[in-house]
Interface confidence: medium
Amino acid sequence: DASGDLLNTEAHSAPAQRWSMQVPAEVNAEAGDAAVLPCTFTHPHRHYDGPLTAIWRSGEPYAGPQVFRCTAAPGSELCQTALSLHGRFRLLGNPRRNDLSLRVERLALADSGRYFCRVEFTGDAHDRYESRHGVRLRVTAAAPRIVNISVLPGPAHAFRALCTAEGEPPPALAWSGPAPGNSSAALQGQGHGYQVTAELPALTRDGRYTCTAANSLGRAEASVYLFRFHGAPGTST
């Protein structure tokens, strides 16, 4: 009978997807590194190809400050970034393929917290959805790491030494060198975020110059050797 046919048709038609978002409960990363915040979704609008906006916010769902936003034009797979807080956030996923995964660069301890992904369909579908529980990003402190140590030509045929280290909390840098006193004045400048640089402006003696980086989690050392009679500086770490 007719009702049987209707039931049969219903039984064989593909069920509409519900809105849902899949995010991990937690992502762990070390300060200074990058982290990926995964977010995928399903939605009930089959083959939606209209304009869409992908948003990530921090703190609390629906009301927290946005840290990233991009918009894709109808039919386009390119999501044009409209907001990336401090330029450290970029979309890894393709929203057209139900993926809003986000990469966060140069992590600092202050980036710890909850992040919420959101997608908005602003064409015919008029719909949107946001992860309510979000993903918790845990940024762990990092022991110091010396990322660059070098000797460079300075004024009046002198040499200067540069030491760049990273860590969270930002490490304190100190230079030590050949006697007398076995230590030399260093100009220390704050780098960006988790990086610091210290300069030894004038290397007055040949010998070994050591940069020490220390924070509450540990210390790291690296050395350069200055032998002017060799005609060029050598380095050792």
Epitope: R18, W19, S20, E60, P61, Y62, A63, E120, T122, H126, D127, R128, Y129, E130, R132, H133
Partner: antibody, heavy 123, light 107 residues
């Protein structure tokens, strides 16, 4: 049937804090969220905050620094606290149920309301 | 924040007549709009959500329409019990915001 009932102090002195309770029946706070909305005398409606079924919260950012919301599912009660009250906070304070709070999405409407509790800020 | 503007703060109406109340959002809210009715001394009552969907128990003489930024609540053959203040509310984004209200007054 679904019911919400607000209770509060009525009169609050300027710079003091306000505590209001919303007691619900006919549904469980484990399954539904609750909004707070206020209405100054003769004026329109202002949304304050929503507490979701799982206890997470969404505040009106303009008032967030002065608001605190919590709940006790077992007692079917939602609590609103507001600090540093001024005369401009004189209003009827309503709690209202957030209608859908499940896998299917979220709908920021308010399908059942309490009768409200009148709060006057005056010395 | 999205501002909601109801053009008329009050409308003079006749029983049995048709009333149209308008609401304009400062940004696109993509049909995420609700209408509430409030009578003096009472709490608001939800009439319509999703711009057009009538809530259970709301008489069919009420209807909602609109898209984008512009929305309308219509009441056909107005009854005495419809004399009230009507508020629109957007729920596209937080914070949720209401219009200032339109009060219906009998001629």
């Amino acid at each position: 049937q679904v019911q919400l009932k607000e209770s509060g102090p009525g009169l609050v002195a300027p710079s003091q804090s306000l505590s209001i309770t919303c007691t619900v029946s006919g549904f469980s706070l484990s399954n539904y969220g609750v909004h707070w909305v206020r209405q100054p005398p003769g004026k329109g409606l202002e949304w304050l905050v929503l507490i979701w079924s799982d206890g997470s919260t969404t505040y009106n950012s303009a008032l967030k620094s002065r608001l605190s919301i919590s709940k006790d599912n077992s007692k079917s009660q939602v609590f609103l606290k507001m600090n540093s009250l001024q005369t401009g906070d004189t209003a009827m304070y309503y709690c209202a149920r957030h209608p859908y709070d499940d896998y299917s999405g979220y709908y920021y409407t308010m399908d059942y309301w309490g009768q409200g509790t009148s709060v006057t800020v005056s010395s | 924040d999205i501002q909601m503007t109801q053009a008329s703060s009050s409308l003079s109406v006749s029983l049995g007549g048709r009333v149209t109340i308008t609401c304009k959002a400062s940004d696109h809210i993509n049909n995420w709009l609700a209408w509430y009715q409030q009578k003096p001394g009472n709490a608001p009552r939800l009439l319509i959500s999703g711009a057009t969907s009538l809530e259970t128990g709301v008489p069919s003489r009420f209807s909602g329409s609109g898209s984008g930024k512009d929305y309308t609540l219509s009441i056909t053959s107005l009854q005495t019990e419809d004399v009230a203040t009507y508020y629109c509310q957007q729920y596209w984004s937080s914070p949720l915001t209401f219009g200032a209200g339109t009060k219906l007054e009998l001629k």
